[in-house]
């Protein structure tokens, strides 16, 4: 499959620097190549070299980031790292996640309002719900395939002899303490802000305070405000607003064609950050590994249950993802994965999914076709709520830790980790370390101990970066197959299901290209049935 | 019905080591954690720790490392617990207790107790 | 390590009375609180495990309340075979503790 050459909104071949390093104006032998074509001459090899720079570059950052690491911690000496000397040597590693982070609030916002706006607002519910479907079966795949797994791996009985070494009490401190039913109305309250400013580095959490009412003491639960943006409530207030500024019709368009610009231009932001990528991902997994006190015994030690989540996050990622959009796309999903090379070791070295979200969003656009209105509404919504990765982290950690403790899991038990995991995944909203957090949930929902919460955190930082992987991964293939969707039900309908509101349109007219045209969006037809006027106003819901 | 069945008291002198059976019958034994209880003279109870009995790993209380061992014989499905270098103060009643598959952390089964006396 | 306190340390009763023991953690212990009844000579036996379920075996004048750090054991009608030792122990983080013990005797 040779993917045409990306467009902007004026349907013009887009001349900007592209995901994988050459411009977007590239032949479609370079298109070929970059798509996961074969290169065979030296002439092509070059070419090949050229399409794939951005995608080679990040490969190499983490490999040499790795070994610098090993390097860094093994040598000893001079070499040692304090903690000022580590926050130094960190710090291109720290600029890329400033970079990212610095993107994500406009880019969410904008591509959300943008994205909603764009699309009929039928329509846009029939792709919300094929989004959330998807989403939700991968998700409970990959719990049912962490269950699978640490069941019959046995990662805790293996493991048993880490219990000696951290003591007694595995460090319960560690372990957050919430209700099941105050986390859940927690994540309620994030959708809907109460401050739409403060929802930019802020979000809603429920603590508890132990209070005397008539001589007993009572824990209330008190409302607080903690750092770290409420994506959630971000995502739903612009697909909302983007919906609302549509039903204005001509009033709304300018404010529309203000928030298409400004993500484009943040794209373009995008497209320049991407070849810092790299250099920031070699620092950061380098740090990572430097951090580390002693990777060897850990891993000796807690071996099976890393290879558990890790072995768990590559059949869902290699196989399971691939197959499910290879049944419903009959293309090659592993030509897809190539295009998302770059993101997907941005979200190993970053370890966050809402970080990935920018560079995800260039690639899949200019890489693999997806439809920008496509691409700008799925990601963020998936970026939200979809965890695989972390949904099967959960699992496999539940039963490692009830294996651990020697407490049993019959069928009611197991049931309730796979939901639990699948709901509270939802919860964690693409923060670092959210998945850790919300394993407490699922252990309080079958009664398994939490003291062992200490031993997960320990390995955290490997397994996060896993699941982040997945969790990205899993939103790129949930576009990919909705692209596939859209463009099914384009060629069965003679009507296409969308409107494109004037705005999108550039201001002086041209023929609509192909690439642009989709079920999602509906254009009236002029005298001779050409596609060329856009509705003036969409009819009222 | 589940039965744990403990070795007879023991009198012994500061210094001397003693090892204390605990025999499980009534249930599968790699099931469920083995722990033991001390409650000295007229006192209350103490946990010193617990043996995964799937894995043959020992768990110690923080006030029981070093000269207290666990450990098993699962072919006979028995636990053990040895004390090295007895002190006067190690006088008390020791229990193993059969640690609960459920609900985290209690002991559903107890065996009778063996009292070990440590007296020059 | 959490620490559990009884109350009362001792006390007296006659047959057929309504008897309540309080347990209290030193911190949030959800539900993991369980009760065992001990005879002069004998070893500890499980009453009730997660605040309120009696042991199977166990009669049903026993019963269990509370949540969190605050709980009680309730003996509705007490009967000769009653007075004893009562433990709690809590079992929500490692180390599990018992509290000092209640000492139930005839009046």
């Known amino acids: 499959m040779v993917a045409d050459p990306p467009r902007d909104s004026k349907g013009l071949a887009a001349a900007e620097p592209t995901a994988n390093g050459g411009l977007a104006l590239a032949s479609i032998e370079d298109q070929g190549a970059a798509a996961g074509g074969y290169c065979g001459s030296r002439d092509q090899v070059r070419r090949c070299l050229r399409a794939n720079l951005l995608v080679l570059l990040t490969v190499v950052a983490v490999v040499a980031g790795v070994a610098l690491g090993l390097g860094v911690s093994g040598a000893g000496g001079a070499l040692a790292l304090g903690p000022e000397r580590l926050s130094a040597f960190v710090f291109p590693g720290e600029l890329l996640l400033r970079l990212l982070r610095m993107i994500i609030l406009p880019l969410v916002v904008c591509s959300l309002i943008g994205g909603a706006a764009s699309l009929d607002p039928g329509a846009l519910g029939r792709l919300g719900a094929w989004a959330l479907l998807f989403f939700l079966v991968t998700t409970l795949l990959a719990s049912a395939l962490g269950v699978g797994l640490a069941l019959a791996l046995q990662p805790g009985a293996a493991s048993a002899a880490i219990n000696a070494s951290v003591g007694a009490a595995g460090s319960a401190e560690n372990a957050p303490s919430k209700e099941v039913l105050d986390s859940f109305l927690d994540l309620a309250r994030n959708i809907f802000p109460s401050n739409l400013v403060s929802a930019a580095f802020r979000s809603y959490s429920t603590t508890y305070e132990e209070r005397n009412i008539t001589g007993t003491r009572v824990k209330v639960p008190v409302g607080q405000e903690v750092e770290g943006m409420n994506i959630l409530g971000l995502v739903v207030f612009a697909i909302v607003f983007g919906v609302a500024l549509r039903k204005l019709g001509p009033e709304g368009e300018l404010l529309i064609r203000f928030f298409n610009s400004f993500n484009e231009a943040t794209m373009v932001l995008v497209s320049w950050i991407m070849w810092y990528a790299p250099v920031g991902i070699m620092f950061l997994v380098a740090g990572k590994i430097v951090e580390m006190e002693d990777v060897g015994l850990l891993f000796a030690r807690l071996g099976k249950y890393i290879l558990c989540c890790l072995l768990g996050h590559a059949i869902h990622g290699l196989l399971v993802l691939p197959l499910i959009y290879f049944l419903f796309t009959r293309k090659n999903p592993y030509r897809f994965l190539w295009g998302i090379v770059t993101p997907l070791a941005t979200a190993f070295g970053t370890s966050s999914s809402s970080a990935t979200l920018p560079l995800m969003m260039k690639c899949v656009e200019e890489n693999n076709g997806v439809a920008k209105h496509i691409s700008r509404f799925i990601l963020p919504i998936g970026a939200t709520v979809n965890m695989d990765g972390a949904a099967l982290f959960q699992c496999v950690a539940a039963v490692f830790i009830a294996q651990l403790s020697q407490q049993s899991l019959d069928f009611v038990k197991i049931i309730t980790i796979l939901v639990t995991a699948t709901a509270s995944s939802v919860g964690a909203a693409g923060i670092p370390a959210g998945g850790v957090l919300t394993l407490a949930i699922i252990l309080e929902a079958v009664n398994l101990p939490v003291d062992h919460i200490s031993l997960i955190l320990a390995v955290d930082w490997l397994v996060d970066r896993s699941c982040t992987v997945l969790n990205v991964e899993g939103d790129a293939l949930g576009a990919g197959l909705l692209q596939n969707y859209v463009d099914r039900t384009e060629s069965r309908s003679t009507e296409p299901e969308l409107i494109q509101v004037k705005s999108e349109l550039p201001l002086d007219p041209l023929p609509v290209p192909t690439e642009e045209g989709n079920p999602l969006l509906k254009h009236y037809r002029g005298p001779a049935g050409d596609a060329t006027v856009a509705s003036e106003k969409e009819s009222v819901m | 019905q589940v039965q744990l069945v403990q070795s007879g008291s023991e009198l012994k002198k500061p210094g001397a080591p003693v090892k204390v059976s605990c025999k499980a019958s009534?249930?599968?034994?790699?099931?469920?954690?083995m722990s033991w209880v001390r409650q000295a003279p007229g006192q209350g109870l103490e946990w010193m720790g617990w043996?995964?009995?799937?894995?043959?790993?020992?768990i110690y209380g923080d006030d029981f490392k070093g000269r207290f061992v666990f450990s098993l014989d699962t072919s006979v499905s028995t636990a053990y617990l040895q004390i090295s270098s007895l002190k006067a103060e190690d006088t008390a009643v020791y229990y193993c207790?059969?640690?609960?598959?459920?609900?985290?952390?209690?002991?559903?089964?107890w065996g009778q107790g063996t009292t070990v006396t440590v007296s020059s | 390590d959490i620490q559990m306190t009884q109350s009362p340390s001792s006390l007296s009763a006659s047959v057929g009375d309504r008897v309540t023991i309080t347990c209290r953690a030193s911190?949030?212990?959800?539900?993991?609180l369980n009760w065992y009844q001990q005879k002069p000579g004998k070893a500890p036996k499980l009453l009730i495990y997660?605040?309120?379920r009696l042991h199977s075996g166990v009669p049903s004048r026993f019963s269990g309340s509370g949540s969190g750090t605050d709980f009680t054991l309730t003996i509705s009608s007490l009967q000769p075979e009653d007075f004893a030792t009562y433990y709690c122990?809590?079992?929500?983080?490692?180390?599990?503790?018992f509290g000092q013990g209640t000492k139930l005797e005839i009046k």
């Open positions: 207790a059969r640690r609960s598959d459920n609900y985290r952390y209690f002991f559903d089964y």
């Open positions: 009534g249930y599968t034994f790699s099931t469920f954690g």
């Open positions: 043996i995964h009995t799937y894995a043959g790993v020992p």
């Open positions: 911190q949030d212990i959800r539900n993991y």
């Open positions: 997660y605040t309120s």
């Open positions: 122990q809590q079992g929500h983080t490692l180390p599990p503790t």
